[in-house]
Interface confidence: low
């Protein structure tokens, strides 16, 4: 399921281009596209240009992060007169042109979405041959990747004064709320320790003092689901183990 939010579209005049009044350079992209991790998303991008019936060589490019300077994630080239844009770059093989640049459509499909794909993308078209011109979307399209929580690390570490502390790190979008439960904490304790902190899609919560032996469970929850992982503390046996 892919949701496209078309709040704003770009219709930016490239003042460097001497164009007929009929058609100017412009690019139309949605403000945001939202899709779930693991799914595919389509990033729409269509354009107009001032070069009537241009049929020469062209290159279509998508970059991530920032316009003009961000790393390219996709690039293809079409020979003169050809409807086929030959892929020259597809990062990790997950990017595929869905549109046809010859028909003013640069729409891109991104397969197997990951949270790391949550960023802004910019489409660009370059004409070569008898016409030399290029244009790139300035605002781009934000790809919003949603994901149910996943606990990526849970561990018990030595703390001050021979105490132990526990760390739980989870990822998800929206960023999940973390809660610890365990001996003397009460079951299903919803209180996230004040040391909980987020970095992008990652959230970490620390349980600063494990005062009792037993099983400590970290629960991560957001609007899309929940995930649990546990660690066991056995101080008298001189070891601690983790089980997920």
């Amino acid at each position: 399921f892919v949701r496209t939010k078309i709040d704003t579209t770009e219709n930016l005049l490239n003042t460097e281009v001497h164009s007929s009044p009929a058609q100017r350079w412009s690019m139309q992209v949605p403000a945001e596209v939202s899709a779930a991790a693991g799914d595919a998303a389509v990033l729409p991008c269509t354009f107009t240009h001032p070069h009537r019936h241009y049929d020469g060589p062209l290159t279509a490019i998508w970059r991530a992060g920032e316009p003009y300077a961000g790393p390219q994630v996709f690039r293809c080239a079409a020979a003169r007169g050809s409807e086929l844009c030959q892929t020259a770059l597809s990062l990790h093989g997950r990017f595929r042109l869905l549109g046809n640049p010859r028909r003013n459509d640069l729409s891109l499909r991104v397969e197997r979405l990951a949270l790391a794909d949550d960023r802004r993308y910019f489409c660009r078209v370059e004409f070569a041959g008898d016409v030399h011109d290029r244009y790139e979307s300035r605002h781009g399209v934000r790809l919003h990747v949603t994901a149910a929580p996943r606990i990526i690390n849970i561990s018990v570490l030595p703390g001050p004064a021979h105490a132990f502390r526990a760390l739980c790190t989870a990822e998800g979008e929206p960023p999940p709320a973390l809660a610890w439960s365990g001996p003397a904490l009460g079951n299903g304790s919803a209180a996230v320790p004040s040391s909980g902190q987020g970095h992008g899609h990652l959230v970490t919560a620390e349980l600063p003092a494990l005062n009792h032996d037993g099983r400590y469970t970290c629960t991560a929850a957001n609007s899309l689901g929940r995930s649990e992982a546990s660690v066991y503390l056995f101080r008298f046996h001189g070891a601690s183990g983790a089980s997920t």
Epitope: A22, A79, S82, L84, N100, R103, D105
Partner: antibody, heavy 130, light 107 residues
Framework: QVQLVESGGGVVQPGRSLRLSCVAS????????IHWVRQAPGKGLDWVSV????????YYADSVQDRFTISRDNSKNTLYLQMNSLRAEDTAVYYC???????????????????????WGQGTTVTVSS | DIQMTQSPSTLSASVGDRVTITCRAS??????LAWYQQKPGKAPKLLIY???SLESGVPSRFSGSGSGTEFTLTISSPQPDDFATYYC?????????FGQGTKLEIK
């Protein structure tokens, strides 16, 4: 000779499903995009759907989006149109037609040119009626 | 979607007359336009592609012209076999819309 032959038409009740087939012969099926075009009785031509030569791109008219599915089996030289939730207004003669051709050199696609729908089948009639 | 408007809807002509059919697109489609001929009970036949390129085997009395939004199909001297219905079709966008058709009748 080069030809396309449609089949699978018939009379069906509203809300039911039907699958049309189009068998190609006389040309390299896997190098051509193929369309479905329909024509209601006494009316003009109405584009329905297209599928690229390798099945990678599929496009639909708004009127059939989410109800019809185009597919192809290049090993069988066959095109399909799965029609679900049929309506009275889907009553028409359905044609398959081939479009522009790709050019391959040593197994690598180097070009794709569109030259209109140059070969058409004879059509198969679909009637949606209760 | 791009709308294609043909005119006239019906055209009466005599054998040998010069006939012109017009097709207008609701937005610029470059030269991505095809013309088809259809006879009753038969499948359409491609005449012209890329606005002015003559399909192989089509008589030279048929010609196409135009670009952008205005296109014409001309039959320089219609023969009895040419009296049929003609359709234009754009393939600039992936909703390959047809015009509503022009029926060429014998006067």
């Amino acid at each position: 000779q080069v030809q396309l032959v449609e089949s699978g038409g018939g009379v069906v009740q509203p809300g039911r499903s039907l699958r049309l087939s189009c068998v190609a012969s006389g040309f390299t099926f896997s190098t051509y995009g193929i369309h479905w075009v329909r024509q209601a009785p006494g009316k003009g031509l109405d584009w329905v759907s297209v599928i690229w030569y390798d099945g990678s791109h599929k496009y639909y008219a708004d009127s059939v989006q989410d109800r019809f599915t185009i597919s192809r089996d290049n090993s069988k030289n066959t095109l399909y149109l799965q029609m679900n939730s049929l309506r009275a207004e889907d009553t028409a003669v359905y044609y398959c037609a081939r479009e522009g051709m790709i050019t391959m050199v040593r197994g690598v696609i180097i070009d794709y040119q569109y030259h209109g729908m140059d070969v058409w089948g004879q059509g198969t009639t679909v009637t949606v009626s209760s | 979607d791009i709308q294609m408007t043909q005119s006239p809807s019906t055209l009466s002509a005599s054998v040998g007359d010069r006939v012109t059919i017009t097709c207008r697109a609701s937005q610029s489609i470059g030269r991505r336009l095809a013309w088809y001929q259809q006879k009753p009970g038969k499948a359409p036949k491609l005449l012209i592609y890329k606005a002015s390129s003559l399909e192989s085997g089509v008589p030279s009395r048929f010609s196409g012209s135009g670009s952008g939004t205005e296109f014409t199909l001309t039959i320089s001297s219609p023969q009895p076999d040419d009296f049929a219905t003609y359709y234009c079709q754009q393939y600039h966008s992936y909703s390959y819309t047809f015009g509503q058709g022009t029926k060429l009748e014998i006067k």
